[in-house]
Interface confidence: low
């Protein structure tokens, strides 16, 4: 029995619902009474949801899963996962048994956009050209880990004196803090870009130092 799932991972935003697609080809005369369907976590074999003896056996996964009962007879064994969490990320296997048996695994990639970075400057007053300043770029509650890049006002990458830390909160979302130490020129703009590698989504922050006062666009 051929069971089909998408090759590419299913990307789902934290808090949204995701559909893990799975389909099979029912033979003529197929009845749901013949169908045994099991969704489980690929790695741990934990049961997620099942259908057997013509009945939806329900969710075994925090009551956040559902099948599409009206579509099962057409060979649609997809699983709806509600209110996606970081911890849901991974591989799910769809097992279908009628007379023959088939299975396939689909990957769920969880993502969350990063907030617009906030920029802080230390010291933040009485600055002169030649002073060393520390610029901190902070962005919150994204997933997965961010790519953090710095550049100057001309678009030149600044990679020399950068320290980036990423801490996961209790939901598994990351807060990122990137620190750039730089010697001030006469004036200048310093930009931080926080990139979500899955969503290919950027969040920008910048600070412009023009003697006094500083501006934080």
């Amino acid at each position: 029995l051929e069971v089909q799932v998408p090759e590419d991972p299913v990307v789902a935003l934290v808090g949204t619902d995701a559909t893990l697609c799975c389909s099979f080809s029912p033979e003529p005369g197929f009845s749901l009474a013949q169908l045994n369907l099991i969704w489980q976590l690929t790695d741990t074999k934990q049961l997620v949801h099942s259908f057997a003896e013509g009945q939806d056996q329900g969710s075994a996964y925090a009551n956040r899963t559902a099948l599409f009962p009206d579509l099962l007879a057409q060979g649609n064994a997809s699983l709806r996962l509600q209110r996606v969490r970081v911890a849901d990320e991974g591989s799910f296997t769809c097992f279908v048994s009628i007379r023959d048996f088939g299975s396939a695994a689909v990957s769920l990639q969880v993502a969350a956009p990063y907030s617009k970075p906030s920029m802080t400057l230390e010291p933040n007053k009485d600055l002169r050209p030649g002073d060393t300043v520390t610029i901190t770029c902070s962005s919150y509650r994204g997933y997965p880990e961010a790519e953090v890049f710095w550049q100057d006002g001309q678009g030149v990458p600044l990679t020399g004196n950068v320290t980036t830390s990423q801490m996961a909160n209790e939901q598994g979302l990351f807060d990122v803090h990137s620190v750039l130490r730089v010697v001030l020129g006469a004036n200048g703009t310093y930009s931080c870009l926080v990139r979500n590698p899955v969503l290919q989504q950027d969040a920008h922050g910048s600070v412009t130092i023009t003697g006094q006062p500083m501006t934080f666009p």
Partner: antibody
Framework: QVQLVESGPGLVKPSQTLSLTCTVS??????????WSWIRQHPGKGLEWIGY???????YYSPSLKSRVTISVDTSKNQFSLKLTSVTAADTAVYYC????????????WGQGILVTVSS | EIVLTQSPLSLPVTPGEPASISCRSS???????????LDWYLQKPGQSPQFLIY???NRASGVPDRFSGSGSGTDFTLKISRVEAEDVGVYYC?????????FGQGTKLEIK
């Protein structure tokens, strides 16, 4: 300029695991903004990206190799490593470690490469 | 994945003459931040690749100004204004817009 040097066995038997290490000098893996990568080149062929790791442990792998590849980092030794399981002759290649610079997504520094032959 | 197609695959050039290599992408490499994520690398015989051009047209540190990158969207060109003997090797374009990062198949530049 940062230096990268690959090390590991040049010969691996089919079905076994290929293990390589890249040692970074004149620069710290722990500095942000860089992604420590593996790229390979089959004999007489082009370049294939395998994956990368960020110093904090975040990884990203090529989908075609994802099921067989693991990249890890040891910041205390300033090293990162590649493991490729269940190798076949098709995995015979020169393996390069490289540093990907953040803003440009470019591989700005490369190791000299190490030829790994898969053969019994 | 994004496919990069280079042409020509072989390029014989007389020293002092210009050379041009084309790289075509299966989708636009211009990202919403305004950057074009295309690089050029040179792999000299028996060596690892070296970084030439990043973000479409920016020369890497130490790269002679006879090398220039141009193009936008899906069509890109690497130009060498006056080829020198030390420029021989295989030139690769690479997209850094999205994973998996992919390379063109390479253009072998040789001296006539």
């Amino acid at each position: 300029q940062v230096q990268l040097v690959e090390s590991g066995p040049g010969l691996v038997k089919p079905s076994q695991t290929l293990s390589l290490t890249c040692t970074v000098s004149d620069g710290s893996i722990s500095s942000g903004g860089y992604y420590w990568s593996w790229i390979r080149q089959h004999p007489g062929k082009g370049l294939e990206w395998i994956g990368y790791i960020y110093y904090s442990g975040g990884t990203y792998y090529s989908p075609s190799l994802k099921s067989r590849v693991t990249i890890s980092v040891d910041t205390s030794k300033n090293q990162f490593s590649l493991k490729l399981t269940s190798v076949t002759a098709a995995d015979t290649a020169v393996y390069y470690c490289a540093r990907r610079a953040g803003y440009s997504s470019s591989f700005d520094s490369w190791g000299q490469g190490i030829l790994v032959t898969v053969s019994s | 994945e994004i496919v990069l197609t280079q042409s020509p695959l072989s390029l014989p050039v007389t020293p002092g003459e210009p050379a041009s290599i084309s790289c075509r992408s299966s989708q636009s490499l211009l990202y919403s931040n305004g950057y074009t994520y295309l690089d050029w690398y040179l792999q000299k015989p028996g060596q690892s690749p070296q970084f030439l051009i990043y973000l479409g047209f920016n020369r890497a540190s130490g790269v002679p100004d006879r090398f220039s990158g141009s193009g936008s969207g899906t069509d890109f060109t690497l130009k060498i204004s006056r080829v020198e003997a030390e420029d021989v090797g295989v030139y690769y374009c690479m997209q850094g817009l999205q994973t998996p990062y992919t390379f063109g198949q390479g253009t072998k530049l040789e001296i006539k």
